[in-house]
């Protein structure tokens, strides 16, 4: 299950009103609408793990789920890079990889995912409330960033099976991205809706999953999603505490996870050990799309506990320049 922009349910036309032609004009907008809302919107997922053996050692994994080509990945901690965060590593798919202490090893795991091992000793060592952010610059989507931190040890979701976390979508640049065909489809859809407005037509009824959806709109984001639109950056900070978990773990000892997976079809595909590791159903999940952060959960992001805002003064194209993205 994932919280998305809700597509209103279209009631079938009253008999004899539009006939076969009317039926087709209803199906087509529905299909186009689904495409408009879901296509062209990449996502970034983040997983943070504290090693059971070394409590000050972290492994961060990030992945990009989009059709564009990745031109740069920046991993930072303490918030987004350029907004109070500190760069830990910069990875270019062809030019190379750079990392700075306490990063120990940054690497590409696949063409669209990276991992970073941090070892902590001394002042620069990370702790459980550290927020890690991954920013993917890609073409043609632009920059997409996600942040995650370890959930508190009391998190009940730790022993939950790996179920997808709900993710709030902030569809801005992505909706019109990628394909001209899609753009044309969306324009055509608006044209159809306008035509419907000027003649007797089936009335739009908000879907059951979003009772607050405005009746006059072709689609409306969920309440939380709307709230997300005006939260420039939100990151969940959890408290720093020792790992004292006794939770049974299939991969050798206790391990804390913060994860930002997507719906089941887009579950991050990493090595088997990673993929099968229990991921909390509810924890410090953060979805970030095109620089918009939202806490995944039922509350609107700005009411979440321990929420820290990081406005990015550089905007979605901030990764362009001498880092190999031009």
């Amino acid at each position: 299950m994932r919280t998305e922009a809700q597509v209103p349910a279209l009631q079938p036309p009253e008999p004899g009103l539009e006939g076969a032609m009317g039926h087709r004009t209803l199906v087509l907008p529905w299909v186009l609408l689904t495409l408009c809302v879901t296509a062209g919107t990449p996502e970034v997922w983040v997983q943070v793990r504290m090693e059971a053996t070394e409590l000050s050692s972290f492994t961060i994994r990030c992945g990009f789920l989009g059709s564009g080509s990745i031109s740069l990945v920046t991993v930072s901690w303490g918030g987004p890079n350029g907004a109070g965060g500190t760069t830990l590593a910069v990875l270019h798919p062809e030019r190379g990889i750079r990392q700075w202490a306490p990063a120990r090893q940054a690497r590409w795991e696949t063409q669209s995912s990276i991992s970073l091992i941090l070892e902590g000793s001394g002042a620069s060592s990370p702790c459980a409330n550290t927020t890690f952010c991954c920013k993917f610059a890609s073409f043609p989507e632009g920059s997409w960033e996600a942040c995650g931190s370890l959930p508190p040890s009391s998190d009940p979701g730790l022993s939950a099976p790996p179920t997808p976390a709900p993710i709030l979508r902030a569809d801005l640049a992505g909706i019109l991205g990628v394909s001209g065909v899609l753009l044309f489809g969306c324009v055509y859809l608006l044209h159809l809706l306008r035509r419907h407005k000027h003649r007797p037509a089936p009335r739009l009824q908000p879907s059951r999953t979003s009772p607050q959806a405005p009746r006059a709109r072709a689609w409306a984001p969920s309440q939380a999603s709307q709230a997300a639109l005006h939260v420039p950056y939100a990151t969940i900070n959890t408290s720093c505490r020792p790992a004292t978990l006794d939770t049974a773990h299939p991969h050798g000892g206790p391990s804390w996870w913060a994860s930002l997976p997507t719906h089941a079809a887009h579950r991050p595909q990493g090595p088997a050990a990673w993929a099968s590791t229990p991921i909390p159903a509810r924890g410090s999940f953060v979805s970030v799309e095109n620089g918009l952060y939202a806490q995944a959960g039922e509350r609107p992001p700005h009411t979440g506990p321990g929420l820290t805002l990081f406005p990015d003064p550089r905007g979605p194209r901030a990764m362009e320049g001498p880092l190999g993205v031009r």
Epitope: S76, T87, W100, W108, E109, T110, A318, L323
Partner: antibody, heavy 114, light 113 residues
Amino acid sequence: EVQLQQSGPELVKPGASVKISCKASGYTLTDYYMNWVKQSHGKSLEWIGDINPNNGGTNFNQKFKGKATLTIDKSSSTTYMELRSLTSEDSAVYYCASLFFDYWGQGTTLTVSS
Amino acid sequence: DIVMTQSPSSLSVSAGEKVTMSCKSSQSLLNSGNQKNYLAWYQQKPGQPPKLLIYGASTRESGVPDRFTGSGSGTDFTLTISSVQAEDLALYYCQNAHSSPYTFGGGTKLEIK
């Protein structure tokens, strides 16, 4: 247009220290990750180290640890490399270069001579 | 440290000829995760700083003429100039962009007859 402007040539005595600069312009301040490279006369290039502008974090070629110190002044978008306990072996042209070596400064010639 | 070995150390060709130079690394520069080779080629003309020509073993930097081609994988790499021009007179360096320290080869000096 990205430009890396380095300080002028230096003539110093053995045992002394020198600080050469590299002023970056034409791109986002936080993107001033900088490499330093040494080229001895008639020889190849040697990577000295790099600096992260966010926190001044550095990486060094083991060979230059203790010899070079890298710092950054964000307000002037300038990176500095200080070389200490200079010997004739340190006489070379020193270049600053952007993170993935796609932009280079014009070079600073250092001559260590008594 | 990864050792980069270039050959030949110098070569002399006439304008219009095709030229190839080799670079070998002591360890593989292939990143297994994304199957990319982290090797770069630079051109350095007299009195100038090096100029990035090729990165990722085969991707031309923007503005670099298409007569320059990089190839190879793992530990063996080649820079080819399909039709040498007078302005190509320079030193050519390969560089390990895979892991620190980012070592350079000894260079190949290209002279025009």
